[in-house]
Interface confidence: low
């Protein structure tokens, strides 16, 4: 007997062909001999089967001797042997309907697990193979599990169900909820406005939740909450903000924060958390702020940086268009009795300048000592 595989929710067309290329009487029945549909002349008649409102045929094909059974919105329980009776002969077709669903939501937080469950008719023994968007293959039986989802797992998962040498393909769109970057670093001169952006790596039409930015300043003994906010249908509303610093927050996505000015006391690391409605767990993004200050006090020219710098970063002081006077893998450098001119303080990583601050040193006129 012919085997046809179908997908839950889809439409299937079971074929039945007569030798005569004309419209003749036919009936489709299920294995319990309950009539599903047939014809009476040019009219379609339906029997008392549970398929009643979901069963149909193509009248336009009857004249060619084709009498298909179309079943819409397939259910697992539609799996059965269907019999087409035409011209004193019976054609049997075994229909097996499968369903593949994600255990929970198809929107999962980074690091969470994805479980795909196969619904199959009794007596079937299918095998399943799924291919992730990044090309990883997973095989299994009734359930397939993938732990520790990563951002690259977002996209269409293609799963193939194999039964009786026939296959049916499912496509499941999985969205991994995460920020685009796990961590970012902003380099600013003292006094400059600071922009922090937290773009999400996914788009959801109705995004609701709440978030908070905790900040650990390098100079502070403990971290503090700088801002708390709500997200309702992609609109951001600030719940509470510290007075110092007074952060501004954009009203729309991507989440955007503005620090009025960079100051050494603000340099440090922040952790933005976002809790999404109906999701367990939170999204996190780390953000770092490095602040540079160049000062001249009496005969001492100093350049300092605050914040989380890596040990391989180089801090230099140089007179414009000249070689560096001082270069150290430290957070402060200085020059005593600097020459007059435009001095540059540079923070660099493997020759790439990350931050630059200029300071003008004026000539010092020595006044004669009075006799």
């Amino acid at each position: 007997k012919k085997v046809v595989l179908g997908k839950k929710g889809d439409t299937v067309e079971l074929t039945c062909t007569a030798s005569q290329k004309k419209s003749i009487q036919f009936h489709w029945k299920n294995s319990n001999q309950i009539k599903i549909l047939g014809n009476q002349g040019s009219f379609l008649t339906k029997g008392p089967s549970k398929l009643n409102d979901r069963a149909d045929s193509r009248r336009s094909l009857w004249d060619q001797g084709n009498f298909p059974l179309i079943i819409k919105n397939l259910k697992i329980e539609d799996s059965d042997t269907y019999i087409c009776e035409v011209e004193d002969q019976k054609e049997e077709v075994q229909l097996l309907v499968f369903g593949l669903t994600a255990n929970s939501d198809t929107h999962l937080l980074q690091g969470q697990s994805l479980t795909l469950t196969l619904e199959s008719p009794p007596g079937s023994s299918p095998s399943v193979q799924c291919r992730s968007p990044r090309g990883k293959n997973i095989q299994g039986g009734k359930t397939l599990s993938v732990s520790q989802l990563e951002l690259q797992d977002s996209g269409t998962w293609t799963c193939t169900v194999l039964q009786n040498q026939k296959k049916v393909e499912f496509k499941i769109d999985i969205v991994v909820l995460a920020f685009q970057k796990a961590s970012s670093i902003v380099y600013k001169k003292e006094g400059e406005q600071v922009e922090f952006s937290f773009p999400l790596a996914f788009t959801v039409e109705k995004l609701t939740g709440s978030g908070e930015l905790w900040w650990q300043a390098e100079r502070a003994s403990s971290s503090k909450s700088w801002i708390t906010f709500d997200l309702k249908n992609k609109e951001v509303s600030v719940k509470r903000v510290t007075q110092d610093p007074k952060l501004q927050m954009g009203k729309k996505l991507p989440l955007h924060l503005t620090l009025p000015q960079a100051l050494p006391q603000y340099a440090g690391s922040g952790n933005l958390t976002l809790a999404l409605e109906a999701k367990t767990g939170k999204l996190h993004q780390e953000v770092n702020l490095v602040v540079m200050r160049a000062t001249q006090l009496q005969k001492n020219l100093t350049c300092e940086v605050w914040g989380p710098t890596s040990p391989k970063l180089m801090l230099s002081l140089k007179l414009e268009n000249k070689e560096a006077k001082v270069s150290k893998r430290e957070k402060a450098v200085w020059v005593l009795n600097p020459e007059a001119g435009m001095w540059q303080c540079l923070l660099s990583d493997s020759g790439q300048v990350l931050l630059e601050s200029n300071i003008k040193v004026l000539p010092t006129w020595s006044t004669p000592v009075q006799p």
Epitope: T203, E205, S210, E235, S237, K239, K251
Partner: antibody
């Protein structure tokens, strides 16, 4: 300035369908949701549904779910609301609307009168 | 669904007097300190006009004679003082959750 301009009045027979358009200008069309609201003569306002023009994702009032289709064409900055299987009690003025900076509908189309009569 | 009821159904006020319209929601429309209730004015043959959003915020360009208050389930729109051209129907609307809903309206007439 923000403007929402709707298509003209329609007269339909019961059982027919109607498709009302709403052309937006004066802002980035994909940045804001377009809502549809109707008002029967001398009656109150009733929310039909909404569309996110950027993605085409639409949400509708369960009361209309099987009969309404809300779509948007980004190329022409136009939103559409199609209502099928019209009944005489669908006779109403249909409005499209957009939020301002707050949560209320600050911008409205001029309205389209749909009359369902045999 | 959240059902809104307005009272009174109609109201006649003299110019210079205060008009008060109330709106009661079937459930709270508050979310973390904000009340998702809006008020509109509608004149015959025109679309509604937003007056107040989030219970008490005056929409730009709306005269300060209009004010909104309330939280949870009980909200009030006040017009003080009323002027001749305030003759209209006033609607409350919740934007807390789908389906968004409007109140039945209060018809205000100037004596």
């Amino acid at each position: 300035q923000v403007q929402l301009v709707q298509s003209g009045a329609e007269v339909k027979k019961p059982g027919a369908s109607v498709k009302v358009s709403c052309k937006a200008s004066g802002y980035t069309f994909t940045d804001y949701v377009i809502h549809w609201v109707r008002q029967a003569t001398g009656q109150g306002l009733e929310w039909i549904g909404e569309i996110y023009p950027g993605s085409g994702s639409a949400y509708s009032n369960a009361k209309f779910k099987d009969r309404v289709t809300i779509t948007a064409d980004k190329s022409t900055n136009t939103a559409y609301m199609e209502l099928r299987s019209l009944r005489s009690d669908d006779t109403a003025v249909y409005f499209c609307a957009r939020r301002g900076n707050g949560t209320g509908f600050a911008y409205w189309g001029q309205g389209t009168l749909v009359t369902v009569s045999s | 669904d959240i059902v809104l009821t307005q009272s009174p159904a109609s109201l006649a006020v003299s110019p210079g007097q205060r008009a008060t319209i109330t709106c009661k929601a079937g459930q709270s429309v508050d979310y973390d300190g904000d009340s998702y209730m809006n008020w509109y004015q509608q004149k015959p043959g025109q679309p509604p006009k937003l007056l107040i959003y989030v219970a008490s915020n005056l929409e730009s360009g709306i005269p300060s004679r209009f004010s909104g208050s309330g939280s949870g389930t009980d909200f009030t729109l006040t017009i003080n003082p009323v002027e001749e051209n305030d003759t209209a129907t006033y609607y409350c609307q919740q934007s807390y959750k789908d389906p968004l809903a409007f109140g039945p309206g209060t018809k205000v007439e100037i004596k």
